[in-house]
């Protein structure tokens, strides 16, 4: 789903207050609800009628350093006989998410938010067949 | 997919540098790749064999303020005849994502990362039938 544009108002102080110095803000250390965990069904990527594989990208200057991307294994969907049926389509489900980018020069470290597009998994859909012009 | 624990090392300065004052860091204003957009298919939530609905939660002190959660419409999956087949299961696909929480007291504004569990959509899976002991 979409993350709306910041419009940079969210990160600004109220108008009656002095502006943020140097175009940066104070980010408190620690993450709220850090222990919260995905409780997804086991192996759904293999058991799905629109199965997918995972690829892990790693970047030590990003938090989280590990970002996992899904790729649909098939163009069609897997039917009850375990065969691919191309009259149905496996399609990716995408999500916009935020990560934190670390920038450092010597002992000066700053952080910036970055928007990343993640394919989370796949679902099986009835294709839309538009009428031929 | 899972966001690993920070271990608070990501946000620390190198050991040879003076520690971060007051347990906070500098977060630059602006978002990298802010214009990047999900290019997900129209109406896949209705065209899926495991269809879902969306619920929007709104919080003005969170960025993004709008977080969209999916809920599977059915326990089973929709077959070629448009009927629910309960021999298959519609299951949620979840993703851990980061949001930014704004905290203010008067003109003092700070921000903190927060982990949020988002259900992005649903997929149709073959159920795991455990044998009775």
């Amino acid at each position: 789903r979409k993350i709306p544009k910041v419009g940079h108002t969210f990160f600004q102080k109220p108008e009656s207050c002095p502006p943020v110095p140097g175009g940066s803000m104070k980010l408190d250390i620690g993450i709220i609800n850090e222990n919260q965990r995905v409780s997804m069904s086991r192996n759904i990527e293999s058991r799905s009628t629109s199965p997918w594989n995972y690829t892990v990208t790693w970047d030590p200057n990003r938090y989280p350093s590990e970002v996992v991307q899904a790729q649909c294994r098939n163009l069609g969907c897997i039917n009850a006989q375990g065969k691919e049926d191309i009259s149905m389509n496996s399609v990716p489900i995408q999500q916009e998410t935020l990560v934190v980018r670390r920038k450092h020069q010597g002992c000066s470290v700053s952080f910036q938010l970055e928007k990343v597009l993640v394919t989370v998994g796949c679902t099986c859909v009835t294709p839309v067949i538009h009428h031929v012009q | 997919r899972k966001i690993p624990k920070v271990g608070h090392t990501f946000f620390q300065k190198p050991e040879s540098c003076p520690p971060v004052p007051g347990g906070s860091m500098k977060l630059d204003i602006g978002i990298i790749n802010e214009n990047q957009r999900v290019s997900m298919s129209r109406n896949i939530e209705s065209r899926s064999t495991s269809p879902w609905n969306y619920t929007v939660t709104w919080d003005p002190n969170r960025y993004p303020s709008e977080v969209v959660q999916a809920q599977c419409r059915n326990l089973g999956c929709i077959n070629a005849q448009g009927k629910e087949d309960i021999s298959m299961n519609s299951v949620p696909i979840q993703q851990e994502t980061l949001v930014v929480r704004r905290k203010h007291q008067g003109c003092s504004v700070s921000f903190q990362l927060e982990k949020v569990l988002v259900t992005v959509g649903c997929t149709c899976v073959t159920p795991v039938i455990h044998h009775v002991q």
């Epitope: 098939n74 163009l75 389509n89 399609v91 294709p127 839309v128 538009h130 | 997900m40 298919s41 896949i44």
Partner: nanobody, 119 residues
Framework: EVQLVESGGGLVQAGGSLRLSCPVS????????LGWFRQAPGKEREFVAV????????SYADSVKGRFTFSRDNAKNTMNLQMNSLKPEDTAVYYC????????????WGQGTQVTVSS
């Protein structure tokens, strides 16, 4: 704007071969999916073959597996359908199509080319 134009259809005897081609203009060739469909008289349009734009995956309808081959010529932005061992039941109007988003939303279509297989 994406434009698709098929060529290569015609009349052929059972057991013969034809090669259909479809140049794809615009950005559809580098994103989404490409496909060949067919529609026989009085029947619904059906998938014949479909490929991911990257060429990484290609899938075929059971009725054509082992006889038809989907290929793409990246240099010419063209998709091709090599049809061997043709049968009378392969008689149909063949369409190339593109799904711009890998979404199962087949938006772009050629005008179709007739393939007739006589026994």
């Amino acid at each position: 704007e994406v434009q698709l134009v098929e060529s290569g259809g015609g009349l052929v005897q059972a057991g013969g071969s034809l090669r259909l081609s479809c140049p794809v203009s615009g950005r559809a060739f580098s994103r989404g999916r490409l496909g060949w469909f067919r529609q026989a008289p009085g029947k619904e349009r059906e998938f014949v073959a479909v490929a991911h734009w990257s060429g990484a995956i290609t899938s075929y309808a059971d009725s054509v597996k082992g006889r038809f081959t989907f290929s793409r010529d990246n240099a010419k932005n063209t998709m091709n359908l090599q049809m061997n061992s043709l049968k009378p039941e392969d008689t149909a109007v063949y369409y190339c199509a593109a799904d711009s988003e890998t979404s199962g939303n087949w938006v772009y279509w050629g005008q179709g080319t007739q393939v007739t297989v006589s026994s």
